[in-house]
């Protein structure tokens, strides 16, 4: 990409996996790349195979072990290198020093579930995945409620500024169908960003009890 | 916001030696590796060599692999480009540039740009 432009994004799930973007205008779809892991003071490398995602846009995950192992701490330094092939040799397109603990994204929030419903409330919690014990409490959560006739983008976001994995939804309307996503972010990190937001938790509300004033 | 200025630029003899500097300023930049690019008059800027500033780690066009040798000195903040075996067709104006976190060949992948050094090799 001389005249276009170029862009190869990384993020560290905080325990074992690095999941790469690498975009360029111009490239052929069914060209052949990988991006390499370079630690500066692991014995181990990782290789894996981008693969197409959009027209000009191909992603992989280095897969770094168990998904629950701490592979990388917040000292090490990852050298990430992409990699294309040029005819019978390959041809590095990319090198970023890869600083793991500034580039984090967390795995979705999983196993949330209706801990309580009422009328006009309902309480849910949620548990964290692969998130690195480094944290302690040093996580934050955003989280949505999908209301009937509203889109997910129109759903305002309400914030939890500490380790909370659990909400009190309120001012709810009886007897209604909702849906409710979270999503976590560590504190640390220049890069750091949102995790995807988590499978959505339908739940419905009690009725209001009948003859009585909601 | 990085600052970049160049210098070491002049007028050399074909097959002579020259060493280019670059003094970065700014806030992290370690995260804003640098790349050196060149235009000849009449042409386009091109591509010569680039480097991360943790790993050292290097990229080269093929138009200079074996003459020319980028470095850094993290202490000065300082890239290097030692050219040597110069040729009249390495005659351009030599801009150092900075890139958040990735170094590209593509010059549009920099965001930086300082105001270039004149390099003239007479043969």
């Known amino acids: 990409a001389v005249n276009g432009t170029s862009q190869f994004t990384c993020f560290y799930n905080s325990r074992a996996n690095i999941s790469c973007v690498w975009s360029q205008d111009g490239a052929l779809q069914d060209t052949s790349c990988q991006v390499h892991a370079w630690p500066d003071r692991r014995r181990w490398n990782q290789t894996c195979e981008l693969l197409p995602v959009s027209q000009a846009s191909w992603a992989c995950n280095l897969i770094l072990g168990a998904p629950d192992s701490q592979k990388l701490t917040t000292v090490d330094i990852v050298t990430l290198r992409v990699l294309c092939r040029e005819g019978v040799r390959w041809r590095v397109m990319a090198i970023q020093d890869f600083k793991p603990f500034e580039n984090l994204r967390l795995m979705a929030p999983i196993s949330l579930q209706v801990v309580h419903v009422e009328t006009h409330r309902c309480n849910i919690s949620w548990e964290i995945s692969q998130a690195s014990h480094y944290f302690e409490r040093h996580l934050e959560f955003e989280a949505r409620t999908l209301s009937p006739g509203h889109t997910w983008e129109e759903a305002p976001l309400l914030t939890l500024k500490q380790k909370q994995e659990w909400i009190c939804l309120e001012t709810l309307t009886p007897d209604t169908q909702y849906e409710f996503q979270v999503r976590v972010k560590p504190l640390q990190g220049e890069f750091t960003t949102w995790s995807p937001w988590s499978q959505p938790l339908a739940f419905r509300t009690k009725p209001a009890a009948l003859g009585k004033d909601t | 916001e990085v600052q970049l200025v160049e210098s070491g630029g002049g007028l050399v003899q074909a097959g002579g030696s020259l060493r280019l500097s670059c003094a970065a300023s700014?806030?992290?930049?370690?995260?804003?590796?640098v790349g050196w690019f060149r235009q000849a008059p009449g042409k386009e800027r091109e591509f010569v060599a680039a480097i991360t500033w943790i790993s050292g780690s290097t990229l080269y066009a093929d138009s200079v692999k074996g003459r020319f040798t980028i470095s850094r000195d993290n202490a000065k903040n300082t890239v290097y480009l030692q050219m040597s075996s110069l040729k009249p067709e390495d005659t351009a104006l030599y801009y150092c540039a900075a890139a958040l976190k990735t170094i590209t060949r593509g010059q549009n992948d920099y965001s930086y740009w300082g105001q270039g050094t004149q390099v003239t090799v007479s043969s």
């Open positions: 700014g806030r992290a930049i370690e995260n804003y590796p």
